[in-house]
């Protein structure tokens, strides 16, 4: 028996369902009584789901997994993982034993889009050209860790005096706070781009300083 999985990682959004594809080629006359299918976490070998002795043995992984029972006899051994969490990320092994056995691993990459950044300024009044200001760009509930880029109004990257911190919450999602310290010119726009490297999703925020009032 030869087991086939997708070479590319499966990307799943947090709180959605994901399908880890796995297939085998049944011989003529194959019956489910011959099939032994085990899904497990590749690294820890923790059992996730199994089908043995002719029946679905069910989920061994927080009751969020399911097979496609009607498709098993056609060689579809895919696993459905419901309500994906950050902690589900990793490699899953699909093991199939009929007369012979084979296995293959498929990677699950979890992702969550970042919120539109909010911009804050400190100080936020009585600003004069030449003042040092702190601009904070905050974006929430994303995964994995973001890449943050700052640019001025002409699109020139600002790399000096940038401090970025990322903190995971109890669900493993990241809140990102990036602080730019800059000396004000006569007027100017400062934009922050928060990029999710897996989703290739960009979230933009900007602040324009033109004397008073400020534009966000």
């Amino acid at each position: 028996v030869e087991v086939q999985v997708s070479e590319d990682p499966v990307v799943a959004l947090v709180d959605t369902d994901a399908t880890l594809r796995c297939s085998f080629s049944p011989e003529p006359g194959f019956s489910l009584a011959q099939l032994n299918l085990i899904w497990q976490l590749t690294d820890t070998k923790q059992l996730v789901h199994s089908f043995t002795e002719g029946r679905d043995q069910g989920s061994a992984y927080s009751n969020r997994t399911a097979l496609f029972p009607d498709l098993l006899v056609q060689g579809n051994a895919s696993l459905r993982l419901q309500r994906v969490r950050v902690t589900d990320e990793g490699s899953y092994t699909c093991f199939v034993s009929i007369q012979d056995f084979d296995s293959a691993a498929v990677s699950l990459q979890v992702a969550a889009p970042y919120s539109k950044p909010s911009m804050t300024l400190e100080p936020n009044k009585d600003l004069r050209p030449g003042n040092m200001v702190t601009i904070t760009c905050s974006s929430y509930q994303g995964y994995p860790e973001a890449e943050v880029f700052w640019k001025d109004g002409q699109g020139v990257p600002l790399t000096g005096n940038v401090t970025t911190s990322q903190m995971a919450n109890e669900r493993g999602l990241f809140d990102v706070h990036s602080v730019l310290r800059v000396v004000l010119g006569a007027n100017g726009t400062y934009s922050c781009l928060v990029r999710n490297p897996v989703l290739q999703q960009d979230a933009h925020g900007s602040v324009t300083i033109t004397g008073q009032p400020l534009t966000f």
Partner: antibody
Framework: QVQLQQSGAEVKKPGSSVKVSCKAS????????ISWVRQAPGQGLEWMGG????????NYAQKFQGRVTITADESTSTAYMELSSLRSEDTAVYYC????????????WGKGTTVTVSS | EIVLTQSPATLSLSPGERATLSCRAS??????LAWYQQKPGQAPRLLIY???NRATGIPARFSGSGSGTDFTLTISSLEPEDFAVYYC???????????FGQGTRLEIK
């Protein structure tokens, strides 16, 4: 070509335990089935249990359940068989054997490890 | 647990003769059956797997047949080096537990 190198002969007291190792060289290890088979003097072959390292799941012959533990270390391509509560009837040659690619039949065998249980 | 019974226990033949060894399972093992040869002081050697497939390097005079509960190992024309003990082996579907027959001793007549 694949070879299975087993640890050396052991002499043990009744009631003690023995741990025999089996190191694979010259081929992949994790995705093959490893079995342990013993043969008492003048007797036939007796399967004790086996493991597929990639799965980490061992299973045992009913007769040895609770007394034998089979493990595999993928990082060193080594399988282990530990037999506890030894008695004189456990005196035998212990073989490790590897299945063919994706198979449970045993196409490569170690040379065997003699375990003698004597007070 | 499936029991394999081999017959005869001992078979006495001369070089050049045909040897037929039998292995009977107490219940169907499909075609999950293998045959091994063992000579004194040596580890067993795989001859046949999946009832009828010759293992790598095994001479064509060895052949296997059968399915379900009745299996046969045939050596078409015995060579002096073929005199040894022969074991059949099966495995259950899941978990993959293995049992051996008690062996057939093939001796020179």
């Amino acid at each position: 070509q694949v070879q299975l190198q087993q640890s050396g002969a052991e002499v043990k007291k009744p009631g003690s335990s023995v741990k025999v190792s089996c190191k694979a060289s010259g081929g992949t290890f994790s995705s093959y089935a490893i079995s342990w088979v013993r043969q008492a003097p003048g007797q036939g072959l007796e399967w004790m249990g086996g493991i597929i390292p990639i799965l980490g799941i061992a299973n045992y012959a009913q007769k040895f359940q609770g007394r034998v533990t089979i493990t595999a270390d993928e990082s060193t391509s080594t399988a282990y068989m530990e037999l506890s509560s030894l008695r004189s009837e456990d005196t035998a040659v212990y073989y490790c054997a590897r299945g063919g690619s994706g198979s449970y039949h045993m196409d490569v065998w170690g040379k065997g490890t003699t375990v003698t249980v004597s007070s | 647990e499936i029991v394999l019974t081999q017959s005869p226990a001992t078979l006495s033949l001369s070089p050049g003769e045909r040897a037929t060894l039998s292995c009977r399972a107490s219940q169907s093992v499909s075609s999950y059956l293998a045959w091994y040869q063992q000579k004194p002081g040596q580890a067993p050697r795989l001859l046949i797997y999946d009832a009828s497939n010759r293992a790598t390097g095994i001479p064509a005079r060895f052949s296997g047949s059968g399915s379900g509960t009745d299996f046969t190992l045939t050596i078409s024309s015995l060579e002096p080096e073929d005199f040894a003990v022969y074991y059949c082996q099966q495995r259950s579907n899941w978990p993959p537990r293995i049992t051996f027959g008690q062996g057939t001793r093939l001796e020179i007549k």
